[in-house]
């Protein structure tokens, strides 16, 4: 719709966004599902967590994720439009001390155990590009989003604003 040559132009200098304070502005537990209503589940296997995208059986309990929302300042000299903007960034933690991380080298989404302050790889810029769905863009790699590939979460490069609404990067949050 906007004829932008690549999402880098669309989301500039996310690397340099500073997170305002170290405490989240809000936190809550929600289940995470895909645009097509498959559930994101987490399983402990061989002392490490695996992330799956799957259809749950009827009445099967959905895994919950703690979403922590942070406000990030985006100074006008970086935003490209002369406006000091703010963004929402999130971290996602399905179990104590473990957070979703972007592994940009492997184009994968992994669960890592770590202490606060969390590394930048654990922060995702929140988009709601589609009615009542959200997308998660890597803070460390603008234009790269958490997406679904082969029943797993992966990092997916979105190369134009038209593709921001592609179903495999859209997720639903539900507190039930």
């Amino acid at each position: 719709a906007f004829g932008i040559s690549g999402v880098q132009k669309y989301t500039r200098a996310l690397h340099d966004s500073s997170i305002t304070g170290i405490s989240p502005i809000t936190e809550y537990l929600a289940s995470l599902s895909t645009y097509n209503d498959q559930s994101i589940t987490f399983a402990l296997e061989d002392e490490s967590y695996e992330i799956y995208v799957e259809d749950l059986k009827k009445d099967e309990k959905k895994d919950k994720v703690l979403l922590s929302y942070y406000e990030s300042q985006h100074p006008s000299n970086e935003s490209g439009d002369g406006v000091d903007g703010k963004m929402l960034m999130v971290t996602l933690s399905p179990t104590k001390d473990f957070w979703l991380h972007a592994n940009n080298k492997e184009h994968s989404v992994e669960l890592h155990k770590c202490e606060k302050p969390l590394p930048d790889q654990a922060f995702f810029v929140l988009h709601n590009m589609h009615s009542n769905c959200v997308s998660f863009e890597c803070k460390t790699d603008p234009g790269v989003f958490i997406g679904v590939k082969d029943n797993h979460l992966a990092l997916i490069k979105v190369d134009s604003s038209e593709n921001l609404c592609t179903e495999n990067i859209l997720f639903k949050l539900s507190e039930t």
Epitope: Y69, D81, G85, N128, M129, E162
Partner: antibody
Framework: QVQLQESGPGLVKPSETLSLTCTVS????????VHWIRQPPGKGLEWIGV???????SYNSALMSRVTISVDTSKNQFSLKLSSVTAADTAVYYC???????????????WGQGTLVTVSS | DIQMTQSPSSVSASVGDRVTITCLAS??????LAWYQQKPGKSPKLLIY???RLADGVPSRFSGSGSGTDFTLTISSLQPEDFATYYC?????????FGQGTKVEIK
């Protein structure tokens, strides 16, 4: 400086189409969602729809069959069309911009001054 | 659609009074609630976003609290310029519905 300015005819005949334009400056439509909201005289606010930063559009289901939102990024404008209007569509129409980049969760930080549209023959 | 119910619909108060307005959502909306102030003939002005965050340039006598379904806007010491109508709005899901408004009038 962030600015939004609504423009369009102040009087529309019943059954015709109401057309308004919002011209924006001081920010990019590729980064912020922009909304149409209306307020009938002496009443509360009603959300009409949003043009999101990625170009997708969502509408209030109560108006969906009659409303169209479109954008002309080259002119920094987005538009509202409301068809088959009746006296109940008489209202001040506002455009507004999201507080946050890329999402509407933070409410609407900047508003136009509003334009009164009267539906009458 | 999520219904937003504001109370009271109007309140009469004096300068210096503490004023509390509540907003109830018909289903949980997390922290995604905004409060606006509107004066006659003017556009709404964002006061509070994300339930508790003060918008730029808003005096600290305004504060917001709550999450889930129950939210409150408090004006700790009412000033002459605060007489206006106040609206809550949920931003958890479309359509982004507003409360019906609370008019704060001079006693």
């Amino acid at each position: 400086q962030v600015q939004l300015q609504e423009s369009g005819p102040g009087l529309v005949k019943p059954s015709e189409t109401l057309s308004l334009t919002c011209t924006v400056s001081g920010f990019s439509l590729s980064k912020y969602g922009v909304h149409w909201i209306r307020q009938p005289p002496g009443k509360g606010l009603e959300w009409i729809g949003v043009l999101r930063a990625g170009g997708t559009i969502s509408y209030n289901s109560a108006l969906m069959s009659r409303v169209t939102i479109s954008v002309d990024t080259s002119k920094n404008q987005f538009s509202l069309k409301l068809s088959s209007v009746t006296a109940a569509d008489t209202a001040v129409y506002y455009c507004a911009r999201d507080h946050y980049y890329y999402s509407s969760f933070g409410g609407f930080a900047s508003w136009g001054q509003g334009t009164l549209v009267t539906v009458s023959s | 659609d999520i219904q937003m119910t504001q109370s009271p619909s109007s309140v009469s108060a004096s300068v210096g009074d503490r004023v509390t307005i509540t907003c109830l959502a018909s289903q949980t909306i997390g922290a995604w609630l905004a409060w606006y102030q509107q004066k006659p003939g003017k556009s709404p002005k964002l006061l509070i976003y994300a339930a508790t965050r003060l918008a730029d340039g808003v005096p600290s006598r305004f504060s917001g609290s709550g999450s889930g379904t129950d939210f409150t806007l408090t004006i700790s010491s009412l000033q002459p310029e605060d007489f206006a109508t106040y609206y809550c709005q949920q931003l958890n899901s479309t359509p982004y519905t507003f409360g019906q408004g609370t008019k704060v009038e001079i006693k």
